[in-house]
Interface confidence: low
Amino acid sequence: ENSFEMQKGDQNPQIAAHVISEASSKTTSVLQWAEKGYYTMSNNLVTLENGKQLTVKRQGLYYIYAQVTFCSNREASSQAPFIASLCLKSPGRFERILLRAANTHSSAKPCGQQSIHLGGVFELQPGASVFVNVTDPSQVSHGTGFTSFGLLKL
Amino acid sequence: ENSFEMQKGDQNPQIAAHVISEASSKTTSVLQWAEKGYYTMSNNLVTLENGKQLTVKRQGLYYIYAQVTFCSNREASSQAPFIASLCLKSPGRFERILLRAANTHSSAKPCGQQSIHLGGVFELQPGASVFVNVTDPSQVSHGTGFTSFGLLKL
Amino acid sequence: ENSFEMQKGDQNPQIAAHVISEASSKTTSVLQWAEKGYYTMSNNLVTLENGKQLTVKRQGLYYIYAQVTFCSNREASSQAPFIASLCLKSPGRFERILLRAANTHSSAKPCGQQSIHLGGVFELQPGASVFVNVTDPSQVSHGTGFTSFGLLKL
């Protein structure tokens, strides 16, 4: 049994996750994550599914966060800014956006790095999943510590 | 006894810290902090050591965060971006990077201000210390509220 | 009775809020918020007052955060950067700044989007209110998820 599981007692175990970005050849705008490096996965009440979403088993309030570092150039990118979105998919419901951040591309060449941080408190239902979307995954920086995603149950 | 200490009972006291940036003449890349202004230090289970690192006495999951505001100019700075790193030093272990953020320098003159926010959930061992590194401490803004560092135990 | 209220027992109910930005015709620099969309208001121990401030009934340590996305242009704006401030008003005290972030305006036209995230742990007294100030509210982005404000009691 995971040591975190017992810290608050069986009725109210600690639930937290922190996962690390993973470069992907997929063309999807959903970022990919892995349990690697200095990751956190407190117990089986939160899981990383298909490398793309954190799924919780218990209803409650969660602080959910994501950090995305990216490198882009104004001339080489579309006119639209780089947008990172924290999204929610609850069982039997449509996906919805919880949080977004937008940064205009840099004029630096070949590209300019910028970091985005998202975070907020949301109620999640049992089986709810959260994931991170970006406008251009190829611009995301995957060096140590630059891009990560996590949550903690209050 | 600090009033925070007892809020969750002796077995599970509240542990939290929030410290304020301090300008330093030191040439080190490690930022300096102080218990001044509207700071938080819940009890002696977390301490600020040597003005540079937050050290915890109890093992567990912590949400750790840092905010750094800096002012830099592309022409006056190195080509490398401004990088802020949240780092961990555990007893008997090498230092490691937990989180990083990178922002390309501004073209604004004399310098352009930017703010970085880092935050994530990590397991800390007893005696573990966390600290913040930046590429150029002379560019950091120390005005009220601009640069701070903290943690809370889940 | 709200389901969150009971999760920690009557003595220590969960206290958390997450509110969504609201465009305002007011000329004040204080941002306006609403309980709309995917908002959180755990119980009556935290309330949104006058659409502008989160007010707490219980003393304790709170993690308070705000995210502001804005769109500005260097030529059309004042020389001063865009600054977002998280402020505290406690009963019988002057207002004070808890956290600030500053971003120099973009050279992109008509305007360049940028996102700011603020967050930290602070002690609040009963009746204390927190609110968010910005240098130019007309530049704030109110699209889904871009600008939000919240807190959670440790």
Epitope: - | I20, E35, K36, G37, Y38, Y39, T40, M41, G143, T144, G145 | S90, G92, R93, F94, R96, I97, E123
Partner: nanobody
Framework: EVQLVESGGGLVQPGGSLRLSCAAS????????IGWFRQAPGKEREGVSC???????SYTDSVKGRFTISRDNAKNTVYLQMNSLKPEDTAVYYC??????????????????????WGQGTLVTVSS
């Protein structure tokens, strides 16, 4: 021992200026808030201005734009520059602090009972 000593008061005509000083000893002023209060004859003591440990300043509505608070950490002294003085500014002016309150002592209060240490006061009279 914590000590505060005010100076700079006096008689001045309406529209004139004065600069009050509050010299602190026994503690490092820069880590704590210093508040200026005033008490007019027959009235309660009221908060006028404050400078917090990190340098943020606050003013009561009636003096905004006329009074400026500042601090010289090297001299361990806080100043209150009073311009465009009015007869209703006539009062004994006190500075106050409370380094015993830890981090709460670094923040500004409007209520005098929140401060543990007071100077002896300096009289400001605005009259023609």
């Amino acid at each position: 021992e914590v000590q505060l000593v005010e100076s700079g008061g006096g008689l001045v005509q309406p529209g004139g200026s004065l600069r009050l000083s509050c010299a602190a000893s026994g503690f490092t002023l820069e880590y704590y808030a210093i508040g200026w209060f005033r008490q007019a004859p027959g009235k309660e003591r009221e908060g006028v201005s404050c400078i917090s440990s990190e340098g943020s300043t606050s003013y009561t509505d009636s003096v905004k734009g006329r009074f400026t608070i500042s601090r010289d950490n090297a001299k361990n002294t806080v100043y209150l520059q009073m311009n465009s003085l009015k007869p209703e500014d006539t009062a004994v002016y006190y500075c106050a602090t409370d380094p015993d309150r830890g981090f709460l002592g670094s923040s500004c209060d409007t209520q005098s009972h929140q401060y543990g240490y007071w100077g002896q006061g300096t009289l400001v009279t605005v009259s023609s």
